[in-house]
């Protein structure tokens, strides 16, 4: 079995019990399906500043249930989507008609999940099916990403002192996507 | 360790109010996540809304628009106003915790809630 992707695309389930992995090293693009209120983290938007502090993206919780086609988790569990703008600090003004418009330059700036924290769930299956444990990974932290004209799209560098660090010794792995997508679109999400 | 006890429920109308509360016992209860779920007779137990310490709150459709869940920390109290009530969110309503990023552990004994039309 491959990943199993729930609502939003940053939690998987885990087949091997015993792993931790690393979170995945490309930026998944597409929105995040759940409905969040009320940000935790009021959104940022820093003007003409390199200061790193200055970058931040807000991370919205929400609470939902497991699933893993008819199977679906004896408890709820809870964690974070990321949202919101991250920058850059440079806008420049671009005239529409009357009304005027703004648009980013410079390199483009992603929140992104950044920590993950490994949870045992067990699932329950209807028609009797033996209950499974899984592991699956929440999002614990959310965090600025810069990617670069220059670059591809899953080549993101960390916003902060470190550079992304390549996954050594560790195969990709297939990630497929959950087909429900029950709850509208969180707006600004990615 | 965290315990939850919740009240406010009863018989109402529909298109009446009731203000649920979820009473905590333990020194932690301001860093967890709370969250109010249902169940109907007959069907799962399903989410309503949830809040976390700093306030941030999440809504299910069901009750988005009628719901509102708020908490205050110094009271150890999480509540859930809810207005427009329909016959259909008749249930048991509980109250859990969880830790930011986890699995809700910790449950109340949950508080009964009918809705007559």
């Known amino acids: 079995q491959g990943w199993q992707a729930f609502k939003n695309d940053a939690t998987e389930i885990i087949p091997e019990l015993g792993e931790y992995p690393e979170p995945p090293p490309e930026l998944e693009n597409n929105k995040t399906m759940n409905r969040a209120e009320n940000g935790g983290r009021p959104p940022h938007h820093p003007f003409e500043t390199k200061d790193v502090s200055e970058y931040s993206c807000r991370e919205l919780h929400f609470t939902r249930y497991v699933t893993d086609g008819p199977c679906r988790s004896a408890k709820p569990v809870t964690e974070l989507v990321c949202s919101g703008q991250c920058g850059p600090a440079r806008l420049l003004p671009n005239a529409i008609g009357r009304g005027k418009w703004w648009r980013p330059s410079g390199p483009d700036f992603r929140c992104i999940p950044d920590r993950y924290r490994a949870q045992r769930v067990q699932l329950l299956c209807p028609g009797g099916e033996a209950p499974r444990a899984r592991k699956v990974r929440l999002v614990a932290s959310c965090k600025c990403k810069r990617l670069t004209r220059f670059h591809n799209q899953s080549e993101l560098k960390d916003f902060g002192t470190e550079a992304a660090r390549p996954q050594k010794g560790r195969k990709p792995r297939p990630r497929a996507r959950s087909a429900k997508a029950n709850q509208a679109e969180l707006e600004n999400a990615y | 360790e965290v315990q939850l006890v919740e009240s406010g429920g009863g018989l109402v109308q529909a298109g009446g109010s009731l203000r649920l509360t979820c009473a905590a016992s333990?020194?932690?209860?301001?860093?967890?996540?709370i969250g109010w779920f249902r169940q109907a007779p007959g069907k799962q137990r399903e989410v309503v809304a949830s809040?976390?310490?700093?306030?941030?709150?999440y809504y299910e459709d069901s009750g988005k628009g009628r719901f509102t869940i708020s908490r205050d920390n110094a009271k150890n109290r999480v509540y859930l106003q809810m207005n427009s009530l329909r016959p259909e969110d008749t249930a048991v309503y509980y109250c859990?915790?969880?830790?930011?990023?986890?699995?809700?552990?910790?449950w109340g004994q949950g508080t009964q809630v009918t809705v007559s039309s």
């Open positions: 859990a915790a969880a830790e930011p990023a986890g699995v809700y552990d910790v």
């Open positions: 333990g020194r932690t209860f301001s860093s967890f996540v």
């Open positions: 809040i976390t310490s700093g306030g941030s709150t």
